[in-house]
């Protein structure tokens, strides 16, 4: 806490300007009116205040707005935002996307801090859902943002927002998240033609079921190995050798390099060796000729 002391004669601040950087902490506390500071917040960022001075300015705003800052002040916080705690931010009501952008800009280039996470949480909850503009903004600043959400939170993303998602935004998503996002993407892109559709849906395919992969195999999509390796193992296992060959097109040769890795390894174990041999890739580990394949999962279902 900064002690309350009278402002020395002639030092009362009439505006927020460069002269204040020479004020000691107690002088800032005594000589800067909190209401003046609130109305001229945009100037604070234009002045190279020190850490300690910024602490005093924050303290003055906290005293003026004990219930939380109004959006008119929040929008102009600039670098003072980095002084805020998650507890401070939970008191705010941020509704403007412009305010959100202004504060995210301050943290640009850094990892998502607890302050930013709290700010985004407050903003999204206030809006009720992750609309396209918000998602556009958040993924522009934090490409990994979508993948930081739980499947439950992702369920509030409307399919229309999926258009804002770029492939790199999904890099760190796990299968559970892609399971939620894939049906939304399928819905969002449903009116696109074959090749355009595949380009858009490709990065979401880690959530695709077997029947959708079978359908894609009929469309000459030439899926690359990197995408294939991200598919759900349980979705790949039922695919026949012919279907995988059609799905991958010229990329099928890449299976050899991946034969020890999932899902390729597990898929090979489910295929007849004769069928694998038709690929001419030297894939080994299939079911030997003459062996009977029992689908135990079907048997369990019947009993």
């Amino acid at each position: 806490e900064v002690e309350k002391t009278a402002c020395p004669s002639g030092k009362k601040a009439r505006e927020i300007d460069e002269s204040l950087i020479f004020y000691k902490k107690w002088e800032l506390e005594a000589c800067v009116d909190a209401a003046l500071l609130a109305t001229q917040m945009d100037r604070v960022n234009a002045i190279p205040f020190t850490y300690e001075q910024l602490d005093v300015l924050k303290h003055k705003l906290d005293e003026l707005y004990p219930q939380g800052y109004p959006e008119s002040v929040i929008q102009h916080l600039g670098y003072l935002f980095l002084k805020m705690s998650p507890e401070d931010i939970r008191k705010w009501n941020v509704t403007s996307l412009e305010t959100l952008k202004a504060l995210l800009e301050v943290n640009k280039g850094h990892e998502m801090s607890p302050q930013v996470a709290t700010l985004i949480d407050r903003f999204v909850k206030g809006r009720g859902q992750l609309d396209k503009d918000t998602l556009d903004t958040l993924t522009a600043f934090y490409p990994g943002y979508l993948c930081s959400l739980s499947p439950e939170e992702l369920s509030s993303v409307p399919p229309s927002s999926i258009w804002a998602v770029r492939p790199q935004d999904l890099d760190t998503c796990d299968p559970r998240q892609l399971d939620v996002l894939y049906p939304k993407a399928r819905l969002a892109f449903q009116n696109m033609n074959g090749s355009e559709y595949f380009v858009k849906i490709q990065s979401f395919l880690g959530g695709a079921p077997t029947e959708d992969l079978k359908a894609l195999s009929q469309q000459n999509v030439s899926m690359d190995l990197a995408t294939f390796m991200k598919l759900r193992t349980d979705a790949v296992l039922p695919l026949t050798v012919a279907e995988v060959q059609k799905l991958l097109g010229p990329h099928v040769e890449g299976l050899k390099a991946e034969e020890r890795h999932r899902p390729v390894r597990d898929w090979i174990l489910r295929q007849r060796q004769d069928d694998l041999d038709t690929l001419g890739l030297g894939l080994q580990g299939g079911i030997p000729n003459g062996y009977l394949v029992l689908d135990l999962s079907m048997q369990e279902a019947l009993s």
Epitope: E18, I21, F22, K24, A46, P48, F49, T50, Y51, E52, Q53, L54, Y79, L82, V106
Partner: antibody, heavy 122, light 107 residues
Framework: QVQLVQSGAEVKKSGESLKISCKGS????????IAWVRQMPGKGLEWMGI????????IYSPYFQGQVTISADKSISTAYLQWSSLKASDTAMYYC???????????????WGQGTTVTVSS | DIRLTQSPSSLSASLGDRVTITCRAS??????LAWYQQKPGKAPRLLIY???TLESGVPSRFSGSGSGTDFTLTISSLQPEDFATYYC?????????FGGGTKLEIK
């Protein structure tokens, strides 16, 4: 790459005027403060003042206020330090340095010019 | 103004030595302190800021510590290129001030 390039060495007589320059490149020159720092022969570093080229706001150290003028021309990414009447005691190495800028309360000098030697004879 | 006192003012050491330079502020400055290296005829170079954060590109043998009034710069194992003069600078309040420097020489 990010750099500050200063004008060459100057030899002057007492009472003459002088303007030395510092040209920035490789970054948004208008978005960072530029500082001037003096180093007298065999001595330490002294902060003289800073300028924000974006709008030419200047903050002088109380010890150099009225002794020098700091200015900038954002259009050519150049900051200046000038004297209207040099004294022998102005003999020193003068450095420009990038200061703070759009980072939070970063009041240190991360990029430096190579320095300009000013020699003033009486 | 905040005065910074560096000690020692000069220091002789050998290659591979561990060296510590101290900087004492005339009043508490939190962690608002930077360290610079200056070689003869060259401009200073930022090594450490915020008392302990290594500037990018600076070798990890350099480290900084301290807060309040007492700070240290440590070089864990001296290399030939480390012989120079080192300055501390406070960023807690204006006017910004530097320490008087510590000249590190080869023994």
């Amino acid at each position: 790459q990010v750099q500050l390039v200063q004008s060459g060495a100057e030899v002057k007589k007492s009472g003459e005027s002088l303007k030395i320059s510092c040209k920035g490149s490789g970054y948004g020159f208008g978005a960072y403060w530029i500082a001037w720092v003096r180093q007298m022969p065999g001595k330490g570093l002294e902060w003289m003042g800073i300028i924000y080229p974006g709008d030419s706001r200047v903050i002088y150290s109380p010890y150099f206020q009225g002794q020098v003028t700091i200015s900038a021309d954002k259009s050519i990414s150049t900051a200046y330090l000038q004297w209207s009447s040099l004294k022998a005691s102005d003999t020193a190495m003068y450095y420009c340095a990038r200061f703070g800028g759009p980072k939070f309360a970063t009041n240190w000098f991360d990029i430096w010019g190579q320095g300009t030697t000013v020699t003033v004879s009486s | 103004d905040i005065r910074l006192t560096q000690s020692p003012s000069s220091l002789s050491a050998s290659l591979g030595d561990r060296v510590t330079i101290t900087c004492r502020a005339s009043q508490a400055i939190s962690s608002a302190l930077a360290w610079y290296q200056q070689k003869p005829g060259k401009a200073p170079r930022l090594l450490i800021y915020d008392a302990s954060t290594l500037e990018s590109g600076v070798p990890s043998r350099f480290s900084g510590s301290g807060s309040g009034t007492d700070f240290t710069l440590t070089i864990s194992s001296l290399q030939p290129e480390d012989f120079a003069t080192y300055y501390c600078q406070q960023a807690d309040s204006f006017p910004l001030t530097f320490g008087g420097g510590t000249k590190l020489e080869i023994k």
